[in-house]
């Protein structure tokens, strides 16, 4: 039975040209995290595997940095980076948990963080 929940940074915004940290946290389960995938709707950005360490998708190597922790840092943001991001936690024995973050990249210098929220 999957009892865990994923807490994410929720809806966030950042300035064009800047960087942003995508963070998720899995709680309320004793399941072992074997791998975390960071993905857009149609593109794998990176994986962090318990044995293999971090593996960044080659096409994002210049703009994505691992961490902090199991999070992911996006750099040199463009307006095209606006959209949904997913943290996918592969766990044993529970299975897969998915969290969602919406990032808006703004042209202006006003970029405020949204509230945290939970996805069961």
């Amino acid at each position: 039975m999957m009892t865990g929940t994923i807490e994410t940074t929720g809806n966030i915004s950042a300035e064009k040209g800047g960087s942003i940290i995508l963070q998720c946290h899995l709680s309320s389960t004793t399941a072992q995290v074997t791998q975390v995938n960071w993905e857009q709707q149609d593109q794998l950005l990176a994986i962090c595997n318990a044995d293999l360490g971090w593996h960044i998708s080659p096409s994002f190597k210049d703009r994505v940095a691992p961490g902090p922790g199991l999070g992911l840092t996006l750099q040199s943001l463009t307006v095209n980076d606006t959209g949904e991001y997913f943290c996918i936690y592969h766990t044993y024995p529970d299975g897969t948990y998915t969290g969602r973050i919406f990032l808006e990249v703004l042209e202006s210098s006003v970029a405020e963080h949204g509230a945290r929220f939970q996805i069961p």
């Epitope: 993905e39 044995d51 971090w54 593996h55 080659p58 997913f86 996918i88 299975g95 998915t98």
Partner: antibody, heavy 121, light 113 residues
């Protein structure tokens, strides 16, 4: 162009070890995972393990844990798979494969030509 | 580990006819959060390494003829060759690429009737 070139065929005695190499060219070696796959005569494909040449981290199929060791040499862009305590059931073709990112998926996109290992007394 | 089961083990089809290969996984390969199925199909001809045909259950690799198509979701998947050609004689494998270990099905040998 991307190429994975494996070492030549080996004949080994039971109990011995074998080390198969896989030399990569045509791409940035540390940017892609390298997988190893076994194919026994007339049989299907069996995943042995994977290495991340960037970090040096490796992961194994439980069936091969303790007997298979996968390493990578960044200076020569070469991955290695060593199998110890060989037995007759290890007679097989061993393939290395590069793992590419295709959309959301990790895919074995380029393969070596295969290395035949024969275990016989 | 995820167990992949293919059927049939072998299949004989006349040239120009449709060939259908099934693959069943012991656990769902669908991530419902992003609606993606983590399943790939490979073709292997004698004396050659496998070659990628389909990934994401239904996306054809570039250069693969459009007579090859993949379908299915969750635990049940199908590879279809709409009109069999002589060069399609091979063994076909499905593969879980949802999580390690990236297990393969047992293979389906496709021959000409």
């Amino acid at each position: 162009q991307v190429q994975l070139v494996q070492s030549g065929a080996e004949v080994k005695k039971p109990g011995a070890s074998v080390k198969v190499s896989c030399k990569a060219s045509g791409y940035a070696f540390t940017n892609y995972l390298i997988e190893w796959v076994k194919q026994a005569p007339g049989q299907g494909l069996e995943w042995i393990g994977v290495i991340n040449p960037g970090s040096g981290g490796s992961k194994y199929n439980e069936k091969f844990k303790g007997r298979a060791t996968i390493t990578a040499d960044k200076s020569t862009s070469t991955a290695y798979m060593e199998l110890s305590s060989l037995r007759s059931e290890d007679t097989a073709v061993y393939f290395c494969a590069r793992t590419g990112v295709y959309g959301n998926f990790l895919i074995f996109d380029y393969w070596g030509q295969g290395t035949t290992v024969t275990v016989s007394s | 580990d995820i167990v992949m089961t293919q059927s049939p083990d072998s299949l004989a089809v006349s040239l120009g006819e449709r060939a259908t290969i099934n693959c069943k996984s012991s656990q769902s390969l669908l991530n419902s959060g992003i609606q993606k199925n983590y399943l790939a199909w490979y073709q292997q001809k004698p004396g050659q390494p496998p070659k990628l045909l389909i990934y994401g259950a239904s996306t054809r690799e570039s250069g693969v003829p459009d007579r090859f198509s993949g379908s299915g979701s969750g635990t049940d998947f199908t590879l279809t060759i709409s009109s069999l050609q002589a060069e399609d004689v091979a063994v076909y494998y499905c593969q879980n690429d949802h999580r390690y270990p990236f297990t393969f099905g047992g293979g389906t040998k496709l021959e000409i009737k």
